[in-house]
Interface confidence: medium
């Protein structure tokens, strides 16, 4: 059997922690360091944990050292620390902070937990937020205090000053959109709503503090965007109110977003704001949720997809059992990472169960959605009879499926920047998600799928997608399945003598490494943590050479279409090359702009599609009461302006060239002369002149790029 041959995969660490806490939080220090920190604690779901233990590995998981005894309250105090969570400095990977769940106390380290110092602090640190650049700077929040206090430390948690009270939420500003040390806070007001403030000096002075928005229900900062919701009472109605979404792009003043809908809006959920456009789930009073997409500013939204699965505590779906397991809103909506414009969503038709759930995918950022093409064959080579025309397709488990299957927790869809185009998911083939569950893999960014493994599995990948590993869920096992060809074929590795109950399979975030960590328990009756480190480098053999790579574009999968005016080409290892990319593999990406087509344009302001939609032309809108085609005022003589032809390029579209662009783009025309006498125009090859018959003056018109002009025309009206 495979177990007797020299194994290309090796277990190089097996640690029994003798620890029975039911949760483990694991953190890789990163930046090529070998440090891993693990916190064992009881679940936070029902109550605060009663005890905890902290372990550190300095050899990338081969061995772990318990450091709980270093987390003490000083001489004479025999109480045990209870750590609910710990924090890692994004500015300096050697620094960690451990906060006590009950006492006003925390411990800090500057050297990967070799030495820890404890400090009594003036509040209970329920939430800490470490600055991304300034390693000494952090904010602390005491949600247990009646006044909801926000504190600041600039010596990495040793001393603190209170900077605000009645705080509902807080966040650091985001580089480069905010000045250094900017803080945003949402502050509770007596009205029941809150006010959003921004400060650049920790609220020390009024001059450096500004009100972003008042009477806010919720606020969120997302990169270039700021989002807030406000409640507005509908005209002539005491009872009925609607919620408005307010948006800022690039830190401009917040403005109310526009949604074209007749139904009152209960709630907004920002599903994605990562690609200079915003996807928002809009929950209506009839418990239906629709997905809208905006232009770049995030202010004008149009409908993208109806009946999207969305859950909210106290809102959509809160009358179901899900309320016992989910205290945060979520949408079944997955952005396929590493690519632009590809998303997978779940549609819901009726109550929240898998019989009513179906999956759809978009390749053009919500322009069109389609059902997922089911694989042609099972993993055993049998033909699958599943036709889209018969209402049969592939459905992928997302967040709701995880919550509905707590005994056998479904793995989320896996897509990462480390392996563009590769997607692994748990799902089923049929009319909905309720059929038998298997693991499905796409190497084509979701255009085509294959059944990779029967039944539900834990899965992850390493070496930038060069090796995929999986372990069966729901049973004791000692088999690690692995594939070096994107899941086409699998081999089995026996990782321990006795079967183990596995809780998770992880690799360091970034998925560059070929080391995988198996978390499990090997005690028959009592749970006790077991951590195994598996190294799969040898399964990939030698470093890849240039011949082992191919150029791949997601467009190739779909008839060479361009998305928003460009085509992206990635360098990908060919699935059948058994070699490793290596930690430092930098995946070259070539983005080339496409020639413009009609699809790259929408109707400009004041224009609309003609009645005959098949013509796809934009005509002046009789409903528009402004003046079309006119130049701006003032329009100084000698300068130019772009006169619309009724079309504008879609926001974020990068296409260029082609006769369509020349035909549809607004034309650059000279500003007209204010009061015109009669004149003659004449051309002399490279320039055009205007002779004023009244004054006898001659002037050259501000036109560029003329070659051999032999004829000219003049539009009298414009």
């Amino acid at each position: 059997s495979a177990a007797l041959q020299p194994e290309p995969i090796k277990v190089y660490g097996q640690v029994s922690l003798n620890d029975s806490h039911n949760q483990m939080v694991v953190h890789w220090a990163g930046e090529k360091s070998n440090v891993i920190v693990a916190l064992a604690r009881d679940s936070l779901a029902l109550a605060r944990p009663k005890s905890s233990d902290v372990y550190v590995s300095y050899d990338y998981g081969k061995s772990f050292k318990k450091i709980s005894d270093k987390l003490n309250f000083g001489l004479g105090n025999r109480s045990e620390a209870v750590i609910a969570q710990f924090y890692h400095s994004p500015a300096d990977n050697k620094r960690y902070i451990f906060a006590d769940a009950y006492a006003q106390y925390l411990w800090i380290t500057f050297d990967f937990c070799n030495t820890l110092q404890g400090f009594s602090i003036p509040f209970r640190a329920a939430d800490l937020l470490l600055h991304s650049k300034a390693s000494n700077l952090l904010l602390g929040f005491d949600r247990s205090h009646p006044n909801k206090q926000l504190w600041k430390s600039d010596d990495f948690g040793q001393t603190w000053i209170m900077i605000q009270e009645h705080v509902k939420s807080f966040s650091w500003g985001i580089d480069p959109y905010d000045k250094p040390n900017t803080i945003y806070i949402e502050r509770h007001e007596p009205s029941g709503y809150s006010t959003v403030f921004r400060s650049t000096d920790f609220f020390q002075s009024r001059e450096n503090q500004e009100v972003i928005l008042e009477e806010v229900r919720d606020f969120q900062l997302r990169d270039k965007y700021m989002f807030a919701t406000k409640v507005v009472h509908l005209l002539g109605s005491e009872q009925q109110s609607s919620v408005q979404l307010w948006v800022s792009f690039g830190r401009k003043p917040m403005r109310a977003a526009q949604f074209v809908t007749r139904h009152p809006i209960n709630e907004y959920y920002i599903a994605d704001a990562s690609e200079d456009q915003v996807f928002v789930c809009v929950s209506h009073s009839n418990n239906r949720t629709n997905l809208y997409i905006s232009e770049a500013e995030g202010l004008k939204f149009s409908l993208s997809l109806e009946n999207v699965l969305y859950y909210s505590p106290g809102g959509a779906g809160s009358d179901t059992l899900v309320r016992y397991f989910a205290n945060e809103p979520f949408a079944d909506f997955h952005r396929v990472e590493g690519l632009q414009g590809v998303y997978i969503a779940t549609l819901i038709n009726g109550s929240m169960n898998e019989e009513n759930m179906r999956s759809v995918i978009t390749f053009d950022k919500g322009g069109t959605w389609e059902f997922l093409q089911a694989p042609a064959f099972t993993g055993y080579g049998e033909k699958i009879n599943c036709e889209l025309s018969q209402g049969c397709s592939l459905h992928l488990a997302q967040r709701l499926s995880q919550l509905l299957n707590l005994q056998l927790r479904r793995m989320p869809i896996l897509s990462k920047e480390s392996a563009p185009g590769l997607i692994i998911a748990t799902g089923s083939v049929g009319k909905n998600l309720a059929s038998k569950t298997n693991v499905y893999i796409s190497s084509s960014a979701g255009a085509r799928w294959r059944e990779a493994l029967p039944g539900p599995h834990y899965y992850t990948w390493g070496d930038h997608g060069g090796i995929i590993t999986a372990i069966a869920q729901g049973m004791e096992t000692n088999e690690l399945k692995y594939s070096t060809n994107e899941g086409e074929t699998w081999k089995t590795f026996i990782f321990s003598e006795k079967p183990v109950f596995v809780y998770g399979l992880l690799t360091e975030p970034g998925e560059k490494s070929t080391v995988f960590t198996i978390f499990g328990s090997n005690k028959e009756n009592v749970h006790s943590w077991l951590i195994l480190q598996v190294n799969a480098t040898d399964a990939l053999g030698v470093p890849c050479t240039e011949n082992d790579y191919k150029l791949w574009s997601p467009s190739d999968e779909r008839g060479n279409e361009c998305l928003l005016g460009h085509k992206t080409v990635f360098k990908r290892r060919t699935p059948h090359a058994t070699c490793f990319n290596g930690e430092d593999f930098d995946r070259p990406v070539v983005v080339s702009n496409c020639s413009c087509t009609r699809e790259d344009y929408e109707c400009d302001f004041g224009f609309k599609m003609s009645e005959d939609l098949s013509l796809e032309v934009c005509v002046p809108d009789p409903e528009f009461s402004g003046k079309s085609y006119s130049p701006p005022v003032p329009c100084p003589v000698g300068s130019t302006y772009r006169r619309t032809r009724g079309y504008r390029k879609i926001s974020g579209d990068t296409c260029s060239g082609g006769d369509v662009e020349a035909r549809l783009e607004g034309e650059l025309v000279p500003c007209p002369l204010a009061e015109e006498n009669e004149f003659i125009l004449y051309a002399v090859r490279k320039s055009i002149y205007r002779y004023d018959l009244a004054s006898g003056a001659t002037e050259q018109l501000p036109l560029t790029g003329l070659r051999a002009a032999v004829a000219l025309d003049f539009d009298y009206e414009h």
């Epitope: 003043p253 403005r255 109310a256 526009q258 074209v260 202010l299 004008k300 939204f301 302001f605 004041g606 609309k608 409903e623 528009f624 009461s625 402004g626 003046k627 079309s628 085609y629 006119s630 130049p631 701006p632 005022v633 003032p634 329009c635 619309t644 007209p672 002369l673 204010a674 009061e675 015109e676 009206e717 414009h718």
Partner: antibody
Framework: EVQLQQSGAELVKPGASVKLSCTAS????????IHWVKQRPEQGLDWIGR????????KYDPNFQGKATITADTSSNTAYLQLSSLASEDTAVYYC?????????????WGQGTSVTVCS | DIVLTQSPASLAVSLGQRATISCRAS??????????MHWYQQKPGQPPKLLIY???TVKSGVPARFSGSGSGTDFSLNIHPVEEDDIAMYFC?????????FGGGTRLEIK
Amino acid sequence: EVQLQQSGAELVKPGASVKLSCTASGFNIQDTYIHWVKQRPEQGLDWIGRIDPANGNTKYDPNFQGKATITADTSSNTAYLQLSSLASEDTAVYYCATSNYYSRGAMDYWGQGTSVTVCS
Amino acid sequence: DIVLTQSPASLAVSLGQRATISCRASESVEYYGTNLMHWYQQKPGQPPKLLIYVASTVKSGVPARFSGSGSGTDFSLNIHPVEEDDIAMYFCQQSRKVPWTFGGGTRLEIK
């Protein structure tokens, strides 16, 4: 510099007519709409109507139909408002103003106003 | 016709405080996501001066203490902090449908 220069104050008898002018400088009126707005003493603003000087098309508030006539002479870059059958309720300051495609219907430049007083 | 109702008719605010003027339209003034609602300031003996167009865009040259918000049928003009120079009448105007109409006006005074 963009400017709208309106004609001087008028004192007229009931039943008479009056023609007010609005001369533009710094731009060509054919590139804009020219609007006329009425403001009675200590009152709000009433939109009378507008003209598209490029083609002579006009739109009026129904309340001013028959009372007001808007015209334009592109050669002199001037717009006109003629008011007929004047009565005491026509006593007001009359403003001309411009809007264009880019202002989305906001009147971004205004004349200084012409005062019309109807008295017997 | 679209009727614009401004409130309050007059408003007294202390210097440095916030003044908020509302304008409600009898029907939506939104045109393909753009709200065709504009705000003007008028001082005695002077023509109106455009402050804000399309609900929230501040005209260049207008101080940043003026801001506009709203959509559909409900709009507001905010002045913060109020200065002595802001004593004036304020009008809203819609250009969504002919006839274009103005609100009745709000007089801003200093307490």
